[in-house]
């Protein structure tokens, strides 16, 4: 999947664009909005009818190295009595994000953009029931 | 920066941390090419906290299209299919990384940007604060 070139007619390539070797792109990894803390939607994960836990995955060859993933606590959903109702399903809600992957080939290092799928939380859904003939 | 294990036979000049600017391959490595959540699942309709998906488009960003969730109700759908206002449908917000064209309009020069997106909705029991 390649990053699309700017296709709009009003997007002419400015003279100020940095020269970039063919087949690659220049990426500044000083993050815009980095002053924002990386954090999760804390405090709803336990109050949800489809509660979830968080785990942190760590990879030193990935930027950012820390990615937080949610996991649904139950297969079913929590009812008004606080019990699991297995007639409903807790399902993960997922979102893609970009990371930079560092690859070592011998002594040389290359960088690759990668899309990763992050589970951000869970929601309670009515199950789809397939009737087997 | 991030410290990484290094091949002991390599020259010491290599930085242990990610450099500020890198040249990356134009091909994005991924197995998840479906960016329209309407096609990937129907949870947005089947959830007890259903949501609508709104298209957020920005040609100076990659990906240029991001679908954002907006909860349909303040309450949640109960077993009878009615909205129960004793519960709350709440958007789940997540910070994600995208690419921002920098300088603007340049085809192959980007900067990472952290943005806040609404991914879906979940049904929660409200905390009621009684204001004196």
């Amino acid at each position: 999947r390649k990053i699309p070139k700017v296709g709009h007619t009003f997007f002419q390539k400015p003279e100020s664009c940095p020269p970039v070797p063919g087949g690659s792109m220049k990426l500044d990894i000083g993050i815009i909005n980095e002053n924002q803390r990386v954090s999760m939607s804390r405090n709803i994960e336990s109050r949800s009818t489809s509660p979830w836990n968080y785990t942190v995955t760590w990879d030193p060859n990935r930027y950012p190295s820390e990615v937080v993933q949610a996991q649904c606590r139950n297969l079913g959903c929590i009812n008004a009595q606080g019990k699991e109702d297995i007639s409903m399903n807790s399902v993960p809600i997922q979102q893609e994000t970009l990371v930079v992957r560092r690859k070592h080939q011998g002594c040389s290092v290359s960088f690759q953009l990668e899309k990763v799928l992050v589970t951000v939380g869970c929601t309670c859904v009515t199950p789809v029931i397939h009737h087997v003939q | 920066g991030i410290t990484i294990p290094r091949n002991p036979g390599c020259p010491n000049s290599e930085d242990k941390n990610f450099p500020r600017t890198v040249m990356v391959n134009l091909n994005i490595h991924n197995r998840n090419t479906n960016t329209n959540p309407k096609r990937s699942s129907d949870y947005y309709n089947r959830s007890t906290s259903p949501w609508n998906l709104h298209r957020n488009e920005d040609p100076e960003r990659y990906p240029s299209v991001i679908w954002e969730a907006k909860c349909r109700h303040l309450g949640c759908i109960n077993a009878d299919g009615n909205v129960d206002y004793h519960m709350n449908s709440v958007p789940i917000q997540q910070e994600i990384l995208v690419l921002r064209r920098e300088p603007p309009h340049c085809p192959n020069s980007f900067r990472l940007e952290k943005i806040l997106v609404s991914v879906g909705c979940t049904c929660v029991t409200p905390i009621v604060h009684h204001v004196a």
């Epitope: - | 709440v90 806040l116 929660v124 409200p126």
Partner: nanobody, 123 residues
Framework: EVQLVESGGGLVQAGGSLRLSCAAD????????MTWFRQVPGKEREFVAH????????YYANSVKGRFTIARDDAKSTVYLQMNSLKPEDTAVYYC????????????????WGQGTQVTVSS
């Protein structure tokens, strides 16, 4: 139905400060992100600041970054907008809104608004 009541607006000299408050009903407040917008007559409502629920950091419009601070007090069901180093171009009606999803800086994503409070900055 959601009730939002803004207060704290007024007339202030350039360089001065004001603190706006937006009180919500407790059931709604603790569960949702809250956002301030502003509007000048004849113009679109403009995003000012967004404070998501709980541990997320706030987001600000570039025009107010470093001058305005959004904060919330869940116990009082109130969101505040501290406005420092005010400029004449900050003159507007300021509205708070409950975030129920969509793109947080787009006014059409919001269904629940306060009545607004007028801020006038004189030079």
């Amino acid at each position: 139905e959601v009730q939002l009541v803004e207060s704290g607006g007024g007339l202030v000299q350039a360089g001065g400060s004001l603190r706006l408050s937006c009180a919500a009903d407790g059931r709604t407040f603790s569960t949702y992100g809250m956002t301030w917008f502003r509007q000048v007559p004849g113009k679109e409502r403009e995003f000012v600041a967004h404070i998501p629920r709980s541990t997320y950091s706030p987001y600000y419009a570039n025009s107010v970054k470093g001058r305005f601070t959004i904060a919330r007090d869940d116990a009082k069901s109130t969101v505040y907008l501290q406005m420092n180093s005010l400029k004449p171009e900050d003159t507007a009606v300021y509205y708070c809104a409950v975030f129920t999803g969509g793109t947080y800086y787009v006014p059409t994503a919001y269904d629940y608004w306060g009545q607004g409070t007028q801020v006038t900055v004189s030079s």
